[in-house]
Amino acid sequence: LNTTILTPNGNEDATTDFFLTSMPTDSLSVSTLPLPEVQCFVFNVEYMNCTWNSSSEPQPTNLTLHYWYKNSDNDKVQKCSHYLFSEEITSGCQLQKKEIHLYQTFVVQLQDPREPRRQATQMLKLQNLVIPWAPENLTLRKLSESQLELNWNNRFLNHCLEHLVQYRTDWDHSWTEQSVDYRHKFSLPSVDGQKRYTFRVRSRFNPLCGSAQHWSEWSHPIHWGSNSSKENPFLFALEAEQKLISEEDLGGEQKLISEEDLHHHHHH
């Protein structure tokens, strides 16, 4: 087999002989195909999915995953015991709660068993990769004639989370956003009784217990107020969106992460 490596512009090339089964140990000129990047997400500190894009392999390859924790009591190399598959090819590994140690450096190694020297190691801070479940049990209560309070629950993580509340009326083009700290409640001081309000919340593992960038999925929306403005076109759009959300959530397991956030990296 003859493999050639080009520079990124595709114009210059240098050819080397490259054997998938027996790579020469004394040759530094051989360039091995890079392994795909592993992306890990810890879901509500209940389980973790570490996934990779198996489609980037030029031939079907069941890559294997090993992991350990650096400089800790858990530094023994572990084999993946629960692989995730895409078209019968390994594309991820699921680790259970007992295997997750948020505050130790997680080392993950991907390897090509057909060519053991083809391997890549990454170090990850798991506390920055936590994605909580969507907030639940949204409730609204009237504090005064014009003031509303929104409350919600998060499963398990509570004080570790910050939140983002979005609300809009049936006359609004876009959402109004408000950041909320770990206290999972939000007050709207001035409510127009003639309008219908929709609220939703998402949460993030930040900043008290970690520095995660990814938000949870949005909660189910909750509504407050008048239903009288049916002639308003924005209301119809809003209701159609709500219907879509409801239908999605009825079907099977709740999707954890929006597709634009995670692309293909989230597996169930």
Epitope: L1, T4, I5, T7, G10, L33, N53, S55, Q59, P60
Partner: antibody, heavy 122, light 108 residues
Framework: QVQLQQSGPGLVKPSQTLSLTCDIS??????????WNWIRQSPSRGLEWLGR?????????DYAVSVKSRITINPDTSKNQFSLQVNSVTPEDTAVYYC????????????WGQGTLVTVSS | DIQMTQSPSSLSASVGDRVTITCRAS??????LNWYQQKPGKAPKLLIY???SLQSGVPSRFSGSGSGTDFTLTISSLQPEDFATYYC??????????FGQGTRLEIK
């Protein structure tokens, strides 16, 4: 919808160089899941895979042993195409040449060029 | 390299017949076996991928089975448009990608 459009001469003299180009639409030659292949077909050899190029943070090429000393496959990112060159051709290289795309994780040729009959003759 | 051997190399059949073409790999290729149909002057067309999955738009009279080294393509009831040449192809261990030598299906 991916389409592959081949171009190049249909007649090449012995000992000269065969050159074909495959224009890609609906995908990028720099895709990180595709491989871009050349295949030829003749009555004596059947369907014969010649080689491929693919981008995975840099460019890679694989060639069939039977032609590796004479073949070059090059991507051209600016034109979103890839090309085939076969040097020192003989009448044995007379065949219909196809370009084709393969992608994971299923690894089949779903998209093919229309084919170019190349005759090697003086 | 993995060699792919198809049999028969040609066969004659009538419209409505059930036809089976076999493909054998020189070593195990799991289920990484694809079947193509080719008509004169045209590029091969994918029929079956991953040994048994029907490509979108392909009539259900085509089916594939097998894994490891032995595979079959079956046409349950031949139609006039099915008379063509059929090829198997492995993508388990590449490069090289290898094809069977083809089975020519003719009208009896």
């Amino acid at each position: 919808q991916v389409q592959l459009q081949q171009s190049g001469p249909g007649l090449v003299k012995p000992s000269q160089t065969l050159s074909l180009t495959c224009d890609i639409s609906g995908d990028s030659v720099s895709s990180n899941i595709a491989t871009w292949n050349w295949i030829r077909q003749s009555p004596s050899r059947g369907l014969e895979w010649l080689g491929r190029t693919y981008y995975r943070s840099k460019w890679y090429k694989d060639y069939a042993v039977s032609v590796k000393s004479r073949i070059t496959i090059n991507p051209d990112t600016s034109k979103n195409q890839f090309s085939l060159q076969v040097n020192s051709v003989t009448p044995e290289d007379t065949a219909v040449y196809y370009c084709a795309r393969m992608t994971g994780p299923r690894y089949y040729f779903e998209y093919w060029g229309q084919g170019t009959l190349v005759t090697v003759s003086s | 390299d993995i060699q792919m051997t198809q049999s028969p190399s040609s066969l004659s059949a009538s419209v409505g017949d059930r036809v089976t073409i076999t493909c054998r790999a020189s070593q195990s290729i799991s289920s990484y076996l694809n079947w193509y149909q080719q008509k004169p002057g045209k590029a091969p067309k994918l029929l079956i991928y991953a040994a048994s999955s029907l490509q979108s738009g392909v009539p259900s009279r085509f089916s594939g089975s097998g894994s490891g080294t032995d595979f079959t393509l079956t046409i349950s009831s031949l139609q006039p448009e099915d008379f063509a040449t059929y090829y198997c192809q492995q993508s388990y261990s590449t490069p090289p990608i290898t094809f069977g030598q083809g089975t020519r299906l003719e009208i009896k």
